[in-house]
């Protein structure tokens, strides 16, 4: 951009050099060029000449007017044309911006990283504001009142180490550009409520050579917490469907879900958890890739029943990945379906 | 750390004028988001400029037309520029610095009384 030129005269923007977007504006460009008469005065944006809807106000003046201006950035300058003088001659230049004032903050989320030692706040800014926006969080005590504030850009990292002195919080964020200020919904935040465990692994799987071959899948996590719930999701990789299966786990050791599945079948396995009975889920897991082994015999083969296997209750739900490249985004479909397990079997996966 | 310490306040008759001033020191005052900020009695702490790095400046809709915030970085030293006062301007007002991540630092503020 234009930062610093030496100005043989003056340019100014009327509403100003930063402007809501779609705005009508005004750009003027004064000359004061000693030995000129300017026989013209030109504006040029991003160094290519205007032709229209420039008006000569006076001798010195001229001022060029565009319809709903649209454009985020825009370098300005002009000339004048002086008579005897081979090339144009500089007189000012300008850097203008439009945008918009920033929407209000939403979907506000406040989670602390287990181990992490920070609260992490995220939050939706909106539509793009094409101008700097500057978010303030806000962190206010319940208990002591005390009231914190951090800049952000689009998240912020908050030391638990300056949450110290009370458990429950409000928090809000303030969006501020110079075309206006908007401010969140309030969170109440509880400290204990909002720890996601540590990030759950799948370390392993294997496929027995049982008459029904089963999938044993191994996964883990760090977390200290105890009581932690966990949803286990897999589908064949030609599949649009994922099948989720729930746990209640305890990490003191690894934990062994069993899976019946189809034969030689390349399978996608993904774990989160969470605290029991909170609100915040880890992410999904990294995808885990398993080849199920090829059915040595004929039989009737049924992937969920089979004479060694008695029902639970609990249900394995079916989602659908809403695009291969978002497998975050699923869609709840009404299907359900109930898991097995072996009636001898003593396994941890039981929940 | 930065340190900020603010000055110029007083009392004031509505219709009149006031320039305050915000003296940084510090070696993280260039990376500073300057703003000024009031509190009235039994009020929550109020955003009334910001210094936006793109040059440009935030001004809270009550002081809109009225306040100016400006910045002489030679001085390390930010202004507001208060005119046509009002009794409701009435507050302590504070100059923060605020850094990406960071917690924001404020002054010791500077009382502004208007009477009418």
């Known amino acids: 951009g234009i930062t610093s030129i030496n100005c043989s005269g003056d340019m100014w923007v009327e509403p100003g050099e930063i402007f809501q977007m779609g705005m009508n504006v005004s750009i003027y460009c004064q000359e004061a060029l000693k030995h000129c008469r300017p026989r013209n005065l030109y504006f040029y944006k991003n160094g290519f000449k205007e032709e229209f809807d420039i008006t000569r106000i006076n001798r010195t003046t001229a001022r060029i007017w565009y319809k709903g201006f649209s454009e985020p950035h825009a370098y300005m300058h002009c000339t004048a044309e002086c008579p005897g003088h081979f090339q144009e001659t500089l007189i000012c230049g300008k850097d203008i911006s439009s945008g918009h004032p920033p929407d209000a903050p939403s979907n506000l989320t406040c989670v602390i990283y287990e181990y992490s030692g920070n609260m992490t706040c995220t939050w939706n800014t909106g539509k793009p504001t094409y101008i700097d926006t500057k978010y303030i969080v806000h962190v206010k005590s319940l208990e002591t009142e005390e009231e914190q504030q951090y800049l952000a850009s689009s998240y912020v990292k908050i030391s638990t180490d300056s949450l110290q002195g009370s458990r429950k919080y409000l928090v809000w964020v303030q969006a501020v550009n110079s075309l206006g200020m908007e401010n969140s919904q309030q969170l109440h935040v509880h400290l204990d409520d909002i720890v996601i465990p540590s990030a759950s692994i799948i370390s392993r799987a294997e496929t027995t050579n049982d008459t029904v071959p089963k999938t044993i899948v191994y996964w883990k996590s760090k977390t200290m917490i105890e009581k932690v719930f966990c949803e286990m999701r897999y589908k064949t990789t030609t599949n649009q469907t994922w099948s989720v299966k729930e746990f209640d786990a305890n990490f003191t050791y690894v934990q062994q879900s069993e899976f019946y599945l189809e034969p030689d079948s390349k399978y996608v396995f993904q774990v989160r958890c969470q605290e029991t009975g909170k609100r915040n889920w880890q992410p999904w897991s990294s995808p885990f890739v398993h080849q199920t082994s090829q059915e040595t015999g004929k039989r009737n083969w049924q992937p969920w029943s089979s004479p060694f296997v008695h029902q639970t209750s609990q249900t394995v739900s079916q989602v659908t990945a809403k695009s291969s490249h978002e497998p975050q985004k699923m869609e709840m479909l009404s299907a359900t379906i109930f898991r097995g397990h072996p009636a001898s079997g003593n396994h941890q996966d039981i929940g | 750390q930065v340190q900020l310490q603010e000055s110029g306040g007083g009392s004031v008759q509505a219709g009149g004028s006031l320039r305050l001033s915000c003296a940084a020191s510090?070696?993280?005052?260039?990376?500073?988001?300057m703003g000024w900020y009031r509190q009235a009695p039994g009020k929550e702490r109020e955003l009334v400029s910001m210094?936006?790095?793109?040059?440009?400046?935030f001004y809270a809709d009550s002081v809109k037309g009225r306040f100016t915030s400006s910045q002489e970085n030679a001085k390390n030293t930010v202004y507001l520029q208060m005119n046509s006062l009002k009794p409701e301007d009435t507050a302590m007002y504070y100059c923060?610095?605020?850094?990406?991540?960071?917690?924001?630092?404020w002054g010791q503020g500077t009382q502004v009384t208007v009477s009418s």
């Open positions: 210094l936006i790095s793109d040059g440009s400046t």
């Open positions: 510090g070696y993280t005052y260039s990376s500073c988001t």
């Open positions: 923060g610095c605020a850094t990406l991540g960071s917690r924001t630092v």
